[in-house]
Amino acid sequence: NKGTDDATADSRKTYTLTDYLKNTYRLKLYSLRWISDHEYLYKQENNILVFNAEYGNSSVFLENSTFDEFGHSINDYSISPDGQFILLEYNYVKQWRHSYTASYDIYDLNKRQLITEERIPNNTQWVTWSPVGHKLAYVWNNDIYVKIEPNLPSYRITWTGKEDIIYNGITDWVYEEEVFSAYSALWWSPNGTFLAYAQFNDTEVPLIEYSFYSDESLQYPKTVRVPYPKAGAVNPTVKFFVVNTDSLSSVTNATSIQITAPASMLIGDHYLCDVTWATQERISLQWLRRIQNYSVMDICDYDESSGRWNCLVARQHIEMSTTGWVGRFRPSEPHFTLDGNSFYKIISNEEGYRHICYFQIDKKDCTFITKGTWEVIGIEALTSDYLYYISNEYKGMPGGRNLYKIQLSDYTKVTCLSCELNPERCQYYSVSFSKEAKYYQLRCSGPGLPLYTLHSSVNDKGLRVLEDNSALDKMLQNVQMPSKKLDFIILNETKFWYQMILPPHFDKSKKYPLLLDVYAGPCSQKADTVFRLNWATYLASTENIIVASFDGRGSGYQGDKIMHAINRRLGTFEVEDQIEAARQFSKMGFVDNKRIAIWGWSYGGYVTSMVLGSGSGVFKCGIAVAPVSRWEYYDSVYTERYMGLPTPEDNLDHYRNSTVMSRAENFKQVEYLLIHGTADDNVHFQQSAQISKALVDVGVDFQAMWYTDEDHGIASSTAHQHIYTHMSHFIKQCFSLP
């Protein structure tokens, strides 16, 4: 920032609440879509341009005027892998976090016209092109259909789909939210011959029911019913099938071949948790027991002579955890070599750090190709010579991210491709590789303004800057912006990282109010090197509040010793560590220890509430948005991963003594704002309703706000503005700010 160190002499405006709510200062992205190993699509002024990666020249792929007469607002588009057709998405209707329904039309790029025959039906739940060519698979009314050609009729693959009961090729609520992070449960083989799919059966899954009030004119509220397995409840069951799309015919039903779960899974409740095609005729499936410390990978080959899929027991790979659960949130996906005979996978090593291990399909043991007291975040690309990965190794900062390549013929030859490109500005990278990894886009998201650059893998040479946010930089020169401090404290000989958003002209000799912004769920990270323009930016810039976040026990990317510390004990160490962090911050000399607040959303709302109910005396006030209040209210897959089952034989005791309600009495010592959306399908309004009831029952005065018909994100324009305005008032009142 230009200006002076003296706040009083700085006449520049601050970053205001209105700036946040109205998004006055916009970060520019550079969202590209690779269509080959040397070309990508980029949308500019609603024209779709095709760029040559090597030379940077572009041509118009599709003019913005093409669909002027279309009559619908196009929500999204998708080009077939052979570049012959474009799928247009409109009539988008959101369902849950990832799921939605929409209408689709197909435009023939050669004929320059819409295909009018054999159209995809309205309210389609999912559509996907085959990886090559232009076959289409889609799900409508919970059944799967395939189109061999866009203008040909659809072949119906399944006939069992039933709303809220049987889901073919799409996930039910809990699989969408907690397992696949997607609505799709369809997987094309690499050349589009086979279509694999999961079928979920929710027949016995209990329903969550809540009112949806809708328009004022609706006399009786609608009741929304969703199959939602809470902790310990009956779970969905899953089956897995593969269909050969070359076999499809209108006059006979498609034959789907089932691949059953391994015997070690069939003995009890289990999940399908990963599907990865290894070759055209080899598929890997990962299955996970309901008690999520044991998983099995099956590798299955197509037997042409029988038309069946065979999964040899000798090729099974077991992954288990003795200290917690498998994977960060689920077992990681394998990255197969071209021949499909070996793969690379991120797993926990002996020291409990997540690293890349090399597996051969016929051997049980694997060879770690990375090691150290840091973690590999993700495998980004695999070629015949190199594996590319993102890790937080650089400078020992868990909150950083850099791109590395490792030579497959010599694992000691590791190069960091991003570390030294722009070390002050850029410490947190993600990457997007072209189809065969000849080129890659680096996306730097902090600590400076986001920077997008294009690179060649041949020599790792930077080709060009795609977006540097210079316009935003110029605008922000005229704003008193906060600074960000990323550091660690040592507790019990362990480093724990924190970040602080510090007011402009921060003076460590002064006393500032502090707001602890908390999430603290398993494998979370709130202390990082990312640049953000958010509510905290306003609080620091305009209200001179320090906004801090702390990654305590249970947080991720620093080894299992830290992450698994809260195994079977949610609501303990991660809560205590936030309190301890606040104590440590108040000892730093620049925090007004009479004005410390805490706030969080979702898991952060739970931790906020548990902290405020702890009776620590550290916090004056706090805000919990959409909090969990009792783990028996939350979904089975997430909750049981960390808590086991709410049964006397397993972990019922801790389920019962980790509730917010049991701490109601202690809320008399704090100011509390409780907020929840009434149509929250994820953390049900029930959770806040029970907190409210418990507080009322012991005579605690508190503030509350509900958001009618809002879900877990409270993201509609009006509700978003209202909640942040409301919370701002609450914090300002708590801190006695004008």
Epitope: E117, P153, D246, S247, V251, T255, G307
Partner: antibody, heavy 116, light 107 residues
Framework: EVQLVESGAGVKQPGGTLRLTCTAS????????VHWVRQAPGKGLEWVGV???????DYDAAFMSRVTISKDTSKSTVYLQMNSLRAEDTAVYYC??????????WGQGTTVTVSS | DILMTQSPSSLSASPGDRVTISCRAS??????LNWYQQKPGQAPRLLIY???NLHSGVPDRFSGSGSGTDFTLTISRLEPEDFAAYYC?????????FGSGTKVEIK
């Protein structure tokens, strides 16, 4: 290269049994269905039946009681067996590969004559 | 069974002529109609699938149209090698049925 070759041509006795073989190459019988069609001299094409990739069969009702289509995937062969032959069964018999809803490859045909 | 009626049963034409052959289904078969060409002493070969889609390797002088019950095969400019029999076939319902054929002869 996809090919279908029929064999089993010849003169058959009325009341006798016909067994034709269709040898397939260049594709898998577990993926594609194989149909049989016949053509009487100077006449049009008449569908007899099909064996699908998964082994299920369908027949024209006119042949249901006396026709069996089977296959040996290890030998890449499909068989058509027809019992109780009569003079009207005299025809060229073709096997064809089913590609979705059309026949994209045909055998050259094999001639069967039913005569005493 | 679905009855497929082809017309005419035969026609005479000269090279360079435009020829149309008609096929009618006894019930709605949507677009599930294929056309085959058969030369004397040879097996039929696929020309057009699903009413209007040209099979690979088939010259573009052949075209198909229609849906529901009425379909047409058109040869825009007859070539000497096009003199043959042409059959339509429905593929929407078993049993599969063919038209009785149209013989295109040299005038």
């Amino acid at each position: 290269e996809v090919q279908l070759v029929e064999s089993g041509a010849g003169v058959k006795q009325p009341g006798g049994t016909l067994r034709l073989t269709c040898t397939a190459s260049g594709f898998s019988l577990t993926t594609y269905g194989v149909h049989w069609v016949r053509q009487a001299p100077g006449k049009g094409l008449e569908w007899v039946g099909v064996i699908w990739g998964d082994g299920r069969t369908d027949y024209d009702a006119a042949f249901m009681s006396r026709v069996t289509i089977s296959k040996d995937t290890s030998k890449s062969t499909v068989y058509l067996q027809m019992n109780s032959l009569r003079a009207e069964d005299t025809a060229v018999y073709y096997c064809m590969r089913n590609r979705h809803d059309w026949f994209d490859y045909w055998g050259q045909g094999t001639t069967v004559t039913v005569s005493s | 069974d679905i009855l497929m009626t082809q017309s005419p049963s035969s026609l005479s034409a000269s090279p360079g002529d435009r020829v149309t052959i008609s096929c009618r289904a006894s019930q709605d078969i949507r677009n599930n109609l294929n056309w085959y060409q058969q030369k004397p002493g040879q097996a039929p070969r696929l020309l057009i699938y699903y009413s209007s889609n040209l099979h690979s390797g088939v010259p573009d002088r052949f075209s198909g149209s229609g849906s529901g019950t009425d379909f047409t095969l058109t040869i825009s400019r007859l070539e000497p090698e096009d003199f043959a029999a042409y059959y339509c076939q429905q593929s929407i319902k078993l049993p599969l049925t063919f038209g009785s054929g149209t013989k295109v002869e040299i005038k």
